[in-house]
Amino acid sequence: KAMHVAQPAVVLASSRGIASFVCEYASPGKATEVRVTVLRQADSQVTEVCAATYMMGNELTFLDDSICTGTSSGNQVNLTIQGLRAMDTGLYICKVELMYPPPYYLGIGNGTQIYVIDPEPCPDSD
């Protein structure tokens, strides 16, 4: 089954290379186990940035070396991606899967274009 996933169209990363956006899904049922995956599309290639499975009401747990962190509140997931550089500019897509209980539902957002601008180095002071 399919469900609608909403996310902002554009986000500008901070000067420290951090970008945050909300991924909201219209849950058709009472899911207890949800999987959220962030995909990146750039240069005709799609790669998985990070993924987390969480139980409703609990925190999202990404892998220790993940560049993503997040919190959940109802049918909203607040995602933060850090360590971004200009070369990481691209379309970041939220994929949500309702894993349990059955039936399985899948939704994929239209993507958030994240722009990353590397900060100018500070000039040397004499």
Epitope: K1, A2, M3, Q41, S44, T47, L106, G107, I108, G111
Partner: nanobody
Framework: EVQLVESGGGLVQPGGSLRLSCAAS????????LGWFRQAPGKGREAVST???????SYADSVKGRFTISRDNAKNTLYLQMNSLRPEDTAVYYC????????????????????????WGQGTLVTVSS
Amino acid sequence: EVQLVESGGGLVQPGGSLRLSCAASGYTYSRHCLGWFRQAPGKGREAVSTISSGGSTSYADSVKGRFTISRDNAKNTLYLQMNSLRPEDTAVYYCAIGPNPRYCSGAPSTRGAEHYFGYWGQGTLVTVSS
């Protein structure tokens, strides 16, 4: 529960033809993308062709002019007509459903496009050999 069942694979000589079918059930979302993917031994899964709910089709460069995707909405069936088959077409062929039509047309030219699809059949083996 969504089910996709492929059929029509087999052994065919180079230059020959096959028609794959994929029967879908349990899927009620009207705006979606249907696709054929293939996976050759030791290689990743790649998008071969897609068709949107509106009927727009797209093909990988390697199969353009040889393969034709179509769908029969009344039968909930997806087809892939494969002509002028080559040994490099040997692979397991899968049909899949993607819930967001935005990524449909670009899938066959995008590496990793399988991420946009979430429902898969069990696959049917196509072997092109003399």
